[in-house]
Interface confidence: medium
């Protein structure tokens, strides 16, 4: 049987499990006495059209009732579980009275108000974020919808809408809740080194330890194949065979420009003649293609004192 | 001729290791990606994950991040696939691919395989 | 990820006859990223079209493929006996690459 819930001294509007498209006409029973629910408006539990109505829901309402859809050649029988809830005492909105998490980006920030559509609303609707009435004009209440401007990770949470429902000239409030996440929109790039510059040379000391870092950036988001690296006369460091020549291990990942990053560094221990005349490429690769830039070295010229 | 030969059938339990191999013959090895790709009985093809010899980088799909390990040794032109905490479910075929690289960068469709190799899981 | 759903599943076609097989994107792909794949039983796959419209080398002119966005199509415009095989289609546009289903295209 399919669930629905409501909260107590609120308006709840069901309808048959069964229903589809039939335009045949439900009869509602209370399931276990058999008892067949009247059509009359002047009852707080009866039934309009394929709809069953609580105006208002009360907590002893809890129960599973039936619905029957008399067809010429064919009954079906739907059962539905209602509950009605005391309303939370705190602000903390528990799991049974959620309806689906809506799952938003940059690209998709509406809020639906779950089941607004079987209820006589007029607009506006009213809207809560973890209970707090929503004022800032990034939030727009439009029909059944809450639109949220320029969406960050700061706009999850839980949100509740509020309306009234119109029956026989009394109105009734109903509140419906549910969660909203914002899921990071990633993108995949053609690599981009930021540093060090295209064609750059370095002054270093002969003698003296020497780094040269390598950053790239790749888009944001999960990156296939995405490494930067160095080469030493096209050659990938750990094959070149000088001990004292090391790209560091562990890259640094980092976040720029809200980019994602990755940092190589080339370390010489001692630099030496024969460093100056080698050619270093810091490669930055993934799925699209590769980039490289050619760093090379020069003896740093001694300041002149005199 | 370019070939992609694979290691021989394997039958292994449940909760170990296997380690199939795909030697390039007649080629640039260093020139290729290498990715495998496998096949249960009766079923499609399922990407695992892809290497780029050149540079030693492996990267895979998600459903096998932490089981799968994919190797290359440029001395002998062969890749390798390691997969552990086997379970029956990965009984299938195990195919080695190669994606070849144009001017600009590896196109990342499969125009060579290897024959396959069957990993049988069984206690 | 994208799901790539091949259709029919089974083809059931005379030899000399035209086959179209269908497959389609869960998302739209550029159609530089699309490739189709035939397999014989207990063999590997072969490469048969890349870039969505592009003959592998050594593809017969009887296989073609169109298709751009989120709908593709292998065309076998003369069916001979040995194209009596398994087909995919695979998008490599985004990782993880993905295969479709298959459609297995049998002596009718």
């Known amino acids: 049987s399919k669930s629905s819930w409501g909260l107590e001294n609120e308006a709840l509007i069901v309808r048959c499990p069964q229903r589809g498209r039939s335009t045949y006409p439900v009869e509602w029973y209370y399931s276990d006495t058999n008892e067949s629910i009247p059509t009359q408006k002047r009852n707080r539990i009866f039934v309009s059209r394929d709809r069953l109505k609580f105006l208002p829901a009360r907590v002893e309402d809890s129960g599973i009732y039936a619905c029957v859809i008399r067809s010429p050649n064919l009954n079906k029988t739907g059962y539905l579980n209602v509950t009605i809830h005391k309303k939370p005492p705190s602000c903390n909105i528990p799991d049974y009275l959620m309806y689906s998490t809506v799952r938003g980006s940059d690209k998709n920030f509406k809020i639906t108000c779950p089941t607004i559509d079987l209820y006589n609303w007029t607009a506006p609707v009213q809207w809560f974020k973890n209970c707090k009435a929503l004022q800032e004009p990034r939030f727009r209440a439009h029909r059944s919808y809450l639109f949220i401007d320029n969406v960050t990770h700061d706009d999850e949470g839980d949100y509740t809408c509020q309306f009234t429902h119109a029956e026989n000239g009394t109105n009734y409030i109903v509140t419906a809740t549910r969660s909203f996440t914002v899921e990071e929109k990633g993108f995949s790039m053609f690599p981009v080194i930021t540093n060090p510059p295209y064609n750059h040379t370095m002054e270093v000391e002969i003698g003296k330890p020497a780094s040269i870092a390598c950053s790239a950036c790749f888009g944001k988001g999960s990156h296939f194949l995405a490494d930067v690296l160095w080469q030493i006369n096209k050659t990938v460091v750990g094959n070149f065979g000088e001990a004292r020549i090391q790209e560091e291990e562990g890259r640094n990942e980092s976040s720029s420009n809200d980019m994602d990053c990755l940092t190589s560094v080339l370390r010489i221990t001692g630099v030496t003649e024969k460093d100056l005349s080698l050619e270093y490429d810091c490669l930055a690769l993934n799925l699209h293609g590769m980039i490289r830039h050619t760093i090379r070295l020069r003896r740093k010229q001694p300041i002149d004192h005199r | 001729q370019v070939q992609l030969v694979q290691s021989g059938a394997e039958v292994k339990k449940p909760g170990s290791s296997v380690k199939v191999s795909c030697k390039a013959s007649?080629?640039?090895?260093?020139?290729?990606?290498i990715s495998w790709v496998r096949q249960a009985p009766g079923q499609g093809l399922e990407w695992m994950g892809t290497?780029?010899?050149?540079?030693?980088?492996?990267d895979y799909a998600q459903k096998f991040q932490g089981r799968v390990t994919i190797t290359a040794d440029e001395s002998t032109s062969t890749a390798y696939m390691e997969l552990s905490s086997l379970r029956s479910e990965d009984t299938a075929v195990y195919y080695c691919?190669?994606?070849?690289?144009?001017?600009?960068?590896?196109?990342?469709?499969?125009?060579?395989w290897g024959r396959g190799t069957l990993v049988t899981v069984s206690s | 990820e994208i799901v790539m759903t091949q259709s029919p599943a089974t083809l059931s076609v005379s030899p000399g006859e035209r086959a179209t097989l269908s497959c389609r994107a869960s998302?739209?792909?550029?159609?530089?990223?699309l490739a189709w794949y035939q397999q014989k039983p207990g063999q590997a796959p072969r490469l048969l079209i890349y870039?969505?419209?592009t003959r592998a080398t050594g593809i017969p002119a009887r296989f073609s493929g169109s298709g751009s966005g989120t709908e593709f199509t292998l065309t076998i415009s003369s069916l001979q006996s040995e194209d009596f095989a398994v087909y995919y289609c695979?998008?490599?546009?985004?990782?993880?690459?993905?295969f479709g289903q298959g459609t297995k295209v049998e002596i009718k």
């Open positions: 290497i780029i010899p050149m540079f030693g980088i492996a």
């Open positions: 998302q739209s792909i550029s159609s530089s990223y």
């Open positions: 007649g080629g640039t090895f260093s020139s290729y990606a």
């Open positions: 870039g969505a419209s």
């Open positions: 691919a190669r994606s070849s690289r144009s001017s600009s960068w590896y196109n990342w469709y499969f125009d060579l």
């Open positions: 695979q998008q490599y546009y985004t990782t993880p690459w993905t």
